[in-house]
């Protein structure tokens, strides 16, 4: 039950996280104009990974796409790549984890396969989350660097009365969305990996055991036996105790004096 809950929760958390990563990637507010030096501007600037926008006080917003690929900063391209990789891995992870969910039955899929799929999706979510966090952090670092550079150059080239105030940019909402979303995807991935351990059958110290009782011979098999997935102990079949009970490998059903009346 706990395994199913952990797996389900991991899936939901990852789903929210990936939705957030997609939202952050598409958002235009990766960097927003810093209004510290000009709080009374009627024109407000903000930029995303794909286009830059200008919002006027009148309510009108005008956006322009970055129609060049080669002319863009390498860092921006790197951030784009990290976010896209994060989305792709996350999407594949979601697809895999749907089939891995314990509550969903697909044909005669064994628990070992579900455990492997859960682990795979968990790893994918972790990498996806890390990609998003890395992408957002790289962009944030770029903003901080540019912010202080433009602050240093703020009033350079002042000729006479004319001020050319350089536009500075600060963190936009998309960065916070990206960080939170990446974190959620990461947490979801960890939860999936934890759930995988619970799904993986550990080989028990006993196999199916035949009890020879007086009366009819009854083969007793412990319920809920799981096939080995390679996780957990891999102990050889051992004789646990004598006295009529033998491991399945040793059982020989010879008729004894007690078998027939």
């Amino acid at each position: 039950m706990a395994v199913t809950a952990c797996q389900g929760l991991g899936f939901v958390v990852s789903l929210i996280g990936i939705a957030g990563i997609i939202a952050a990637t598409c958002m235009d507010q990766w960097s927003t104009q810093d209004l510290y030096n000009n709080p009374v501007t009627a024109v407000f600037n903000y930029q995303g990974l794909w286009r830059s926008c200008v919002r006027e006080s009148s309510g009108f917003t005008e956006c322009r796409g970055y129609f060049t690929l080669l002319g863009l900063p390498a860092m921006l391209q790197a951030v784009r790549a990290l976010m896209i990789v994060g989305i792709v891995l996350g999407a594949i992870g979601l697809l895999v984890s749907i089939f891995a969910l314990k509550c969903i039955r697909i044909g005669s899929m064994e628990d070992s396969a579900k455990a492997n799929m859960t682990l795979t999706s968990g790893i994918m979510f972790i990498v996806s989350g890390l990609c998003a966090i890395a992408g957002v952090s790289v962009f944030a670092n770029m903003l901080v660097t540019n912010f202080w550079m433009s602050t240093a150059n703020m009033y350079t080239g002042m000729g006479g009365m004319v001020q050319t105030v350089q536009t500075r940019y600060t963190f936009g909402a998309a960065l916070f969305v990206g960080w939170v979303a990446g974190g959620l995807t990461l947490i979801g991935g960890v939860m999936m990996c934890i759930a995988c351990r619970g799904l993986a059958p550990e080989e028990t110290n006993y196999k199916a055991v035949s009890y020879h009782a007086s009366g009819h011979s009854v083969a007793y098999k412990p319920g809920g036996f799981k096939a080995s997935t390679g996780f957990g102990s891999n102990t050889k079949n051992k004789k646990i105790y004598d006295g009529g009970a033998r491991t399945e490998d040793e059982v020989q059903s010879y008729p004894s004096k007690h078998d027939y009346v």
């Epitope: 000009n38 009627a42 006080s57 009148s58 322009r64 001020q163």
Partner: antibody
């Protein structure tokens, strides 16, 4: 068609307050901002302030303490209220519609004289 | 506040001539995000309210004759009337609409000889 019409008291005593109403037609105040501009006799234009579609306002810094702009969207009316009037507030007061931060339609103006 | 300086303050010209007036702002009115200069030109004829002529420094308002041309970028702007007509007798104002308060220039008064 787009029209703006200012209506004011005409004569105001010094230290009293001024209230002017701008009634608009042909457009909605929920879609367009409205600016207030004044022009003292024989002088240039002076921007007073603006009220945006969302109701937020911006004012001329020197007049901010005694100027207030509000509106009633349902009545298509914009109100300008100015306190503590002095003789140098005597001017023609105009309201104008905003379009992408420029003023594309203007009212005919209302003359305000501050005198005892 | 941004200070708008217009020159000359008055101009007396003959009909048919080319007229040029300038407007300087104390800060750049160029928005890097959309490459627009937030400067507007108005024409005010005697006894009338101002009329929008040019916005974004160079975009002519619909219905405005093409003899009116706006140019310039950043802090220096120009309004040119290619062939002056008698009805162009007016005061011309430039206005900053980039940063609050939206300051006007003192105006250029155009008189016909």
């Amino acid at each position: 068609q787009v029209q703006l019409k200012e209506s004011g008291p005409g004569l105001v005593a010094p230290s009293q307050s001024l209230s002017i109403t701008c009634t608009v037609s042909g457009f909605s105040l929920t879609s367009y901002g409205v600016h207030w501009v004044r022009q003292p006799p024989g002088k240039g234009l002076e921007w007073l302030g603006v009220i945006w579609p969302g109701g937020n306002t911006n004012y001329e810094s020197a007049l901010m303490s005694r100027l207030s702009i509000s509106k009633d969207n349902s009545k298509s009316q914009v109100f300008l209220k100015m306190n503590s009037l002095q003789t140098d507030d005597t001017a023609m007061y105009y309201c104008a519609r905003d379009r992408r931060l420029a003023m594309d339609y203007w009212g005919q103006g209302t003359s305000v004289t501050v005198s005892s | 506040d941004i200070v708008m300086t217009q020159s000359p303050s008055s101009l007396t010209v003959t009909a048919g001539e080319k007229v040029t007036m300038t407007c300087k702002s104390s800060q750049s009115l160029l928005e890097s995000g959309n490459q627009k200069n937030y400067l507007t030109w108005y024409q005010q004829k005697p006894g009338q309210p101002p009329k929008l002529l040019i916005y974004w420094a160079s975009t002519r308002e619909s219905g405005v004759p093409d003899r009116f041309t706006g140019s310039g970028s950043g802090t220096d702007f120009t309004l040119t009337i290619s062939i002056l007509q008698a009805e162009d007798l007016a005061v011309y104002y430039c206005q900053n609409d980039y940063s609050y308060p939206f300051t006007f220039g003192s105006g250029t008064k155009l008189e016909i000889k």
